[in-house]
Structures are given as C-alpha cells and as structure tokens.
C-alpha cells in the first residue's frame, strides 16, 4: 500500500520560517503534488504550492520556495512574516496524485516542544484520503 510522509521543521535562524518535506512511498509515477495548510486540500485547507513533474512549480505567499528533491519527494520553505505566516501548531498536508495508485494525502505539524532547527526524522504520517 502506498504511503505519504510529511515532515515539518522550524528553521533555527528564522523562528517563524518553516520547511515542509513530503514524500511518496509507492511504485507509481507521480503526476502532481499539492501542498496545503490548515487541513487537507479541498477540505478546508489552503493551497500553498503545486508541483508538476514536467509542467513546473507554482507557489503562493507565504510559500517562498517549492522544489522537487527527488522523483518522489518535495520540499517547501515558508516565509515567516506577516498576517498569513504559519504558527507552531499549523497543520500542513501533502497530496500526491500518482498512476496507477490514485491520490494519497497525509498531514503533519511541528512536533510538540521541538527545538528550532530540529525535527523528528520523516516517518509515514496517517493517510487521510485515498481518492
């Protein structure tokens, strides 16, 4: 069964800056990745970035830089200033659309009482939805 993992990290240098990393553990080819916050995409969450393996990458404030790390993982850096900046208990979700598995999504947030610049190693987060 495919799994999606999500890792959220607060940057030590900028305490209101976050890095989200997500990965897909499956054999299919990924056709689209959507990163959202505040809940799953389409269920109250707000899209931060969309990554397509051939068409490109789109991102919207407060997202600063979205990138493909490997063929099955992505990262997103969030700016930490302004009214729309994330806070420590913000939930971030990643949805991977793949063929032939379909869509798989998982969410994560900053580990409780984590030190800035530190985070737990990425582990598969609960799969919230498989379309």
């Amino acid at each position: 069964t495919p799994e999606v993992w999500v890792q959220v990290r607060m940057e030590a240098t900028e305490l209101s800056s976050f890095t989200i990393r997500c990965g897909f553990l499956g054999s299919g080819s990924i056709s689209l990745v959507t990163v959202s916050w505040g809940g799953p995409n389409g269920a109250g969450g707000t899209t931060l970035a969309v990554l397509h393996p051939e068409r490109g990458i789109r991102q919207w404030a407060p997202a600063r830089q979205a990138r493909w790390e490997t063929q099955s993982s992505i990262s997103l850096i969030l700016e930490g200033s302004g009214a729309s900046s994330p806070c420590a208990n913000t939930t971030f979700c990643c949805k991977f659309a793949s063929f032939p598995e379909g869509s798989w999504e998982a969410c994560g947030s900053l580990p409780p009482s984590s030190d800035p610049g530190l985070s737990a190693p990425p582990t598969p987060a609960p799969i919230l939805r498989a379309d």
Partner: antibody, heavy 114, light 113 residues
C-alpha cells in the same frame, strides 16, 4: 469544455485605472490558479503574475508590482486584473491563462490615449 | 530573471519542408531533483491567443500534431516541425517554466513560401 471569457476592449486616459475580467467555466474555478500575460503590439509575451483562487494568494513579476493587482470573485468564477496609473506603455493585449498555460482567454485590448 | 533568446527571428519555408528553431536560456531549466527541463513552446497565430504545444521540453500537449517535436536540455532547446503545413504560419515562443517570473523568448516568426 474549459473556457475563459475576457471582458471587452478598453480605451482609457493616461493616469486612470482599468479593471479587466476573466470569467472561467467548464471546471472548478478554485482548483486552478490563473495567470495574466501582457502582449504589447507586435511584441513578445510578458508574465504579469498569477493568483490562487482558493485563497487569493498571489505571485507577481516584480516589474508589474504596483502596476497590476490580481483578485478573484469565487462566487462568479471570475478573475480580475486592475491596472493603475496608466501610460502609453501599458497599451497592450492582456490575456488570462489557467495554470500551466494550457487554456487562454481571447485577450482584452487596453488602449491608453488622451 | 532568466533571459530566453530565440533564433532565428524569422524564417520562410515551403510546405513539406523540415524546420528547426532554437531557444537558449540564460540559466539552466533542468530541475535536478527529477532530471526534467521546465521549458514550454507556444504557437501564436495572427489575432489569436498563444497555444501550448510542448511542455517539459519534449512532451506534446494533448491534440498537438506529432510533426511538432521539442528537444534539448539545460540551456539549449529546439522546436522541430518535421513537415511544415500551411496552417503552421505563426509566431513560436519558448518560455521558462522553471522559475519566477516565467519569461518568454522574443519569438520566431514562421512564414510559408
């Protein structure tokens, strides 16, 4: 069928503002961001910026910051671009295009003239 | 900003001939994480909006005839029309789809003899 229907041509005076629209149909408006592109007469294309209808989040080409403002109205599935402090340099055809530029509106001609 | 340079600025060919046009970017458009080039090609006929032909440097958009082929990697890209048809009269633009802002080339105007 995906369609992007833009508002009609505009003749405006220097220093004025203009707001042009792009009404989307044939898909879920909030699922896809909208780009805006400028094409001056006989010239190439310039990306102005894009807006995420889901939350109104925007990304702008620095060149057009302060010149263009992108907004959306989810209830009518319409994207808007307002251009302000217009000069003759702003005379152009302006296009809306859905994310990845696979679907384009027909264009809106803006002419700035006294 | 990434600068996209196209050549030639115009060319005139007879129907049935093979055509190639070049696009060079000032920075690499290769996404190293997935080894894909984020470059697109568009066709714009007179009085019409641009039409997406190629994305990912070499993938044809749905419905685009297979006489259109994109190739290249990094900073050097080519659009080839294997057998030009009269309806291919247009200006062809390449676009940086790698990083903001999404810059376009100045275009190659294709005329049919």
């Amino acid at each position: 069928e995906v369609q992007l229907q833009q508002s009609g041509p505009e003749l405006v005076k220097p220093g004025a503002s203009v707001k042009i629209s792009c009404k989307a149909s044939g898909y879920t408006f909030t699922d896809y961001s909208m780009n805006w592109v400028k094409q001056s007469h006989g010239k190439s294309l310039e990306w102005i910026g894009d807006i995420n209808p889901d939350n109104g989040g925007t990304s702008y080409n620095q060149k057009f910051k302060g010149k263009a403002t992108l907004t959306v109205d989810q209830s009518s599935s319409t994207a808007y671009m307002e251009l302000r402090s217009l000069t003759s340099e702003d005379s152009a055809v302006y296009y809306c295009a859905r994310i990845w530029f696979a679907y384009w509106g027909q264009g809106t001609l803006v002419t700035v003239s006294a | 900003d990434i600068v996209m340079t196209q050549s030639p600025s115009s060319l005139s060919v007879s129907a049935g001939e093979k055509v190639t046009m070049s696009c060079k970017s000032s920075q690499s458009l290769l996404n190293s994480g997935i080894q894909k080039n984020f470059l697109a090609w568009y066709q714009q006929k007179p009085g019409q909006p641009p039409k997406l032909l190629i994305y990912g440097a070499s993938t044809r958009e749905s419905g685009v005839p297979d006489r259109f082929t994109g190739s290249g990697s990094g900073t050097d890209f080519t659009l080839t029309i294997s057998s030009v048809q009269a309806e291919d009269l247009a200006v062809y633009y390449c676009q940086n789809a790698h990083s903001y802002p999404f810059t376009f080339g100045s275009g190659t105007k294709l005329e049919i003899k």
